[in-house]
Amino acid sequence: GEGRKTWRRRGQQPAPAPLPPQRTEAAPGTGQPVESFPLDFTAVEGNMDSFMAQVKSLAQSLYPCSAQQLNEDLRLHLLLNTSVTCNDGSPAGYYLKESKGSRRWLLFLEGGWYCFSRENCDSRYDTMRRLMSSKDWPQTRTGTGILSSQPEENPYWWNANMVFIPYCSSDVWSGASSKSEKNEYVFMGALIIREVVQELLGRGLSGAKVLLLAGSSAGGTGVLLNVDRVAEQLEQLGYPAIQVRGLADSGWFLDNKQYRRTDCVDTVTCAPTEAIRRGIRYWNGMVPERCRSQFKEGEEWNCFLGYKVYPTLRCPVFVVQWLFDEAQLTADNAHLTGQPVQEGQWLYIQNLGHELRNTLKDVPASFAPACLSHEIIIRSHWTDVQVKGTSLPRALHCWDRSLHDSHKASKTPLKGCPIHLVDSCPWPHCNPSCPTIRDQFTGQEMNVAQFLMHMGFDVQTVAQQQGLEPSKLLGMLSSGS
């Protein structure tokens, strides 16, 4: 059966602990807090557990009312401007956890696919109403992964102001339509982001130094579609000093040929390019202006593809993408279903990894592990995966350093602080730090060699193709080289 991913902690090597983190200090003569750099993990990557315990106890002792401050909950705020709504006309909103001492703001766009016709939006409304309506949203949400305020779970930005924006527009955060007679649903994804930013200015965002617009899956694509517009909005409102950046997780899709062509009937089977083509019309979808101008009318769907929109963006964007993304494979009808795969499907999957790697060649800030998975940044164990020995929070920290006091990425990477991290091994889970795979029927954990054989992978044939002894290949697979 198909393996399934869970997360495991990696073995830790001891390393010397660095200086403790600083909170904030007043800039001379201004009374304004100046936030120190994120922690520099150069020396600590191995011995994270004991280091984080020290950081946490220090944070608690330094922070007034620390027990309250370490409450993980983000609180729901429905938009005051009730004309900006979810699909069903209920008000959109956001969850917020303020961090008074910080000038960093993290705005996270939730994912959850899309719908692109009356029929499949009806079905979505009937079975996933939370993604189309705010009527039953809970009053609080727990921040996890990059949204966590616990330094051991979020060594990157644990002290930031955290904002989770629920996805209730089903339009990949692109829509700018309003209620009309002919439309049963409204699609306001782009307008929701704009309104959230507008309302957050009154809640402290106006004093921000950095706004990081992050998102996973459809939210990751939403980052690519909206990051420049957010920067422009803040500039126009008189906040040009706020540095706007993007973090797109699992939203970098390819318009490759489907493994098996299917008719565009529903969200699950429709080829993504066709779904987006139809969707843009249905949603009145907006794409970044600089990208739109490169394509003729009716071809705006191209701007939903990371590798086409990215070169047109002005804001720095960090791209996180599994080389074997499950949503891409689902859209390509090449997903693994627990049955051994055919050789053609195996080659298709390998080729997907190769193509994706190529599209990231010129993306200076990227993290792309050779794993079969989907989404990472709000998983609790997002710190576990490494590419070339570097974890994602560490890579993001290096990216921050490379951008320090500048809107553009520095051309020369910082020594010992890499930001372009793309796996070069060719198979799903050839990276040993990938999320654990479990056998779909027994629930047993599998190593990569077991997984590949389980998938019908022919060790003899592949060893021959690679010019290796089968035993050598199995050894390499097990060690992840």
């Epitope: 009806d122 079905s123 996933m128 949503a327």
Partner: antibody, heavy 116, light 107 residues
Framework: DVQLVESGGGLVQPGGSRKLSCAAS????????MHWVRQAPEKGLEWVAY????????YYADTVRGRFTISRDTPKNTLFLQMTSLRSEDTAMYYC?????????WGQGTSVTVSS | DIQMTQSPASLYVSVGETVTITCRAS??????LAWYQQKQGKSPQLLVY???NLADGVPSRFSGSGSGTQYSLKINSLKSEDFGSYYC?????????FGSGTKLEIK
Amino acid sequence: DVQLVESGGGLVQPGGSRKLSCAASGFTFSSFGMHWVRQAPEKGLEWVAYITSGSGAIYYADTVRGRFTISRDTPKNTLFLQMTSLRSEDTAMYYCARSADGLDYWGQGTSVTVSS
Amino acid sequence: DIQMTQSPASLYVSVGETVTITCRASENIYSNLAWYQQKQGKSPQLLVYGATNLADGVPSRFSGSGSGTQYSLKINSLKSEDFGSYYCQHFWGTPFTFGSGTKLEIK
């Protein structure tokens, strides 16, 4: 209070037909998807059919496609399941259920026995 | 079609214990999963939707977790009223198949 009440069950000969009804009250019927789910004696739940809110698009399980027809009469707040060419394996308790996020309300069920 | 493999098929436990029931999908269902409880001779009742969200009125001792293809329902400190059968169901494209069920019985 949301209520779903099924009716129309009973004993049917193999090859025969039966029409089940589900009367809905306490909510805006047109705003929810409606499903039929069945449970054979001492067995698990089996999803049978679904009609969407709004457009009324229809979906069936392979085991009943071509033999069963789901429909709704929105003004009368009623869901139907027309069953034809019945087989012994269709013997089950038939439930109607409403969906928004999961099947959040179920009727008490109506029993259908297919036997000669 | 997506298959849902639920385990264990039955579980003998005492009041006060904690139990976990798992459900595996044959492919990624992107958290579009619900859990139901059914007591003998009664209709099923929704417990969890969207893999992790507790339905209205469900006690907080119930919790859902998981993503991708593997999901679980955890019941902390079991009460006598928690005994019965539990089913998972996916909503990622029709047919919306159920798991085969887990019968929770008193030890």
